[in-house]
């Protein structure tokens, strides 16, 4: 009774199509599959960025797989062939591993790469990234930003740089069609007569870095003798009402009465007859139903009532 063996996949490689971190892992079927013509061979693929503790594992019948990686670090991957138990009259058979690695060969000491990279997707409409030059680089150093997301044919360079002292320190992006809820890849590289400059790679999803505009049209409405309803409107722009969380800060007679986080555009406040002044501000943020993270907006303009008995009036701006 001969032991059934299978070879690992051939020509296993990681291919970089120039998408700044979105890589193709591809391979060919193993040699000597003739014995298993009736069989659907599967492949178990494991891959990770070098230094990561955990491998991602995929089982597939295909000869390729695509995923995003951090190109600041190397990538390692391994794959083996799986023969299901149906093919072997018994237990599953696995080949040995085929292994491969990939990295962008660095140029320059890490300190030369851009520092404090910060990207904000303002009101889910305008992406702006800014950075500081690397440490110890001269004024002749210039940085260039490239970006890619699924839907673009190739990586694009920034066409509207923000400059300081002749150096690029940021990028205003054009309208980015169908760019949210997918990985957005950025590379900032540089050049200098003086020394080599290290490239930097960044990946994020645009909906997670949204900074909305602040809420508008703040109003007061008397609900009862001891309740006041605070109302506001969502800011202008493409973000739907269901995507907002709000934080309210209310001051009563110059002392902070309450800070609260709410999911809709109203808040009911208990008051006393002694209240002489009431002020509130609101700010907004994209909530967990629409993103995994977000940035609080600036505070709205302050809306105040003062001078009349709160218990007798309906208060409108």
């Amino acid at each position: 009774d001969t032991e059934i063996k299978v070879n690992p996949p051939q020509d296993f490689e990681i291919v970089d199509p120039g998408y700044l971190g979105y890589l193709y892992l591809q391979w060919q079927p193993p040699l000597s599959l003739d014995h298993f013509k009736e069989c659907t061979v599967e492949y178990e693929l494991k891959y990770r960025n070098i230094g990561s503790e955990t491998w991602k594992t995929i089982i597939t019948k295909n000869l390729h797989y695509k995923d995003g990686f951090d190109l600041n670090k190397g990538i390692e991957a391994k794959i083996h062939t799986l023969l299901p138990w149906q093919c072997t009259n018994g237990s599953e058979v696995q080949s040995s591993w085929a292994e491969t690695t990939y990295w962008i060969s660095p140029q320059g000491i890490p300190e030369t790469k851009v520092q404090d990279m910060d990207c904000v997707y303002y009101n889910w409409q305008y992406l702006l990234c800014s950075w500081k030059p690397g440490i110890g680089v001269l004024l002749d150093t210039n940085y260039n930003l490239f970006y890619w997301y699924e839907g673009l044919d190739h990586a694009l360079q920034c066409v509207d740089y923000i400059k300081a002292d002749g150096q690029n320190i940021g990028c205003r992006f054009p309208y980015l069609e169908a760019s949210d809820y997918k990985d957005f890849y950025i590379c900032v590289n540089g050049s200098s007569e003086n020394k080599p400059i290290r490239s930097s790679y960044f990946t994020f999803q645009l909906q997670n870095i949204v900074k909305p505009l602040p809420p508008v049209y703040l109003t007061f409405t008397r609900e009862s003798s001891c309740e006041i309803k605070l109302k506001w409107s969502i800011p202008l722009g493409p973000i739907p009402a269901r995507c907002f969380d709000y934080e309210i800060e209310i001051r009563e007679d110059d002392t902070t009465l309450v800070t609260a986080t709410v999911e809709n555009e109203t808040y009911t406040l208990k008051t006393t007859n002694e209240t002489r002044q009431l002020c509130f501000v609101v700010r907004s943020k994209v909530n967990i139903y629409c993103s995994d993270d977000g940035i609080w907006s600036e505070w709205s303009d302050k809306q105040c009532w003062e001078g009349e008995d709160l218990s007798k009036k309906t208060l409108l701006r």
Epitope: I50, G51, G74, P106, Q107, G108, I109, P110, G136, P196
Partner: antibody, heavy 116, light 108 residues
Framework: QVQLKQSGPGLVQPSQSLSITCTVS????????VHWVRLSPGKGLEWLGV???????DYNAAFISRLNISKDNSKSQVFFKMNSLQANDTAIYYC??????????WGQGTSVTVSS | QIVLTQSPAIMSASLGERVTMTCTAS???????LHWYQQKPGSSPKLWIF???NLASGVPARFSGSGSGTSYSLTISSMEAEDAATYYC?????????FGAGTKLELK
């Protein structure tokens, strides 16, 4: 397997120059940078400089005026030249491969004595 | 330049003993650029721990590394004879790249 083999003189006259060749195998210097580091009794390990895969270099500012690192990709060789050696340059000189912002493989070292 | 100060300069440990050595940087180093090398007499340095806490290929699991900012350490959970060597910390963050003066670990 990855190897870096160094060749160069063991004895250098004061004020003369030191030349060491690092010949690599098992990897390509068009894909990896090569660093130079020395170990001396007085100063421990000192980084001298690096030649990147693309051919550009970074030097320790303390040695920039008398150090030159170059390479020949076709021969898989990296060349180290330091001028104006003095007694305090007596050390073991190493070449090392750059990988992932570390030095993951080192040459066997070249022991250099500066003396007349 | 970033100065790395290792302590102690020399230490000895018995078989099975837990060993910890430290590396203090004169200014903050990103943890992914702080590494440790092992060197034995007559041999070249070997990459031992990279990016603060990742063991290089072939390094026994009794070794570990930790730290952040300006304070880093290398620990051996149970000293073995083959661990006697000099250990250097190294920062790859800023030019010039620098090494600590080393901690020489001897078998008691």
């Amino acid at each position: 397997q990855v190897q870096l083999k160094q060749s160069g003189p063991g004895l250098v006259q004061p004020s003369q120059s030191l030349s060491i060749t690092c010949t690599v195998s098992g990897f390509s210097i068009t894909k990896y940078g090569v660093h130079w580091v020395r170990l001396s009794p007085g100063k421990g390990l000192e980084w001298l400089g690096v030649i990147w895969s693309g051919g550009s270099t970074d030097y320790n500012a303390a040695f920039i005026s008398r150090l030159n690192i170059s390479k020949d990709n076709s021969k898989s060789q990296v060349f180290f030249k330091m001028n104006s050696l003095q007694a305090n340059d007596t050390a073991i000189y190493y070449c090392a491969r750059d990988f992932g912002d570390t030095m993951d493989y080192w040459g066997q070292g070249t022991s250099v004595t500066v003396s007349s | 330049q970033i100065v790395l100060t290792q302590s102690p300069a020399i230490m000895s440990a018995s078989l099975g003993e837990r060993v910890t050595m430290t590396c203090t940087a004169s200014s903050s180093v990103t943890s992914s650029y702080l590494h440790w090398y092992q060197q034995k007499p007559g041999s070249s340095p070997k990459l031992w721990i990279f990016s603060t806490s990742n063991l290089a290929s072939g390094v026994p699991a009794r070794f570990s590394g930790s730290g952040s900012g300006t304070s880093y350490s290398l620990t051996i959970s149970s000293m073995e004879a083959e661990d006697a060597a000099t250990y250097y910390c190294h920062q790859y963050h800023r030019s010039p790249l620098t090494f600590g003066a080393g901690t020489k670990l001897e078998l008691k």
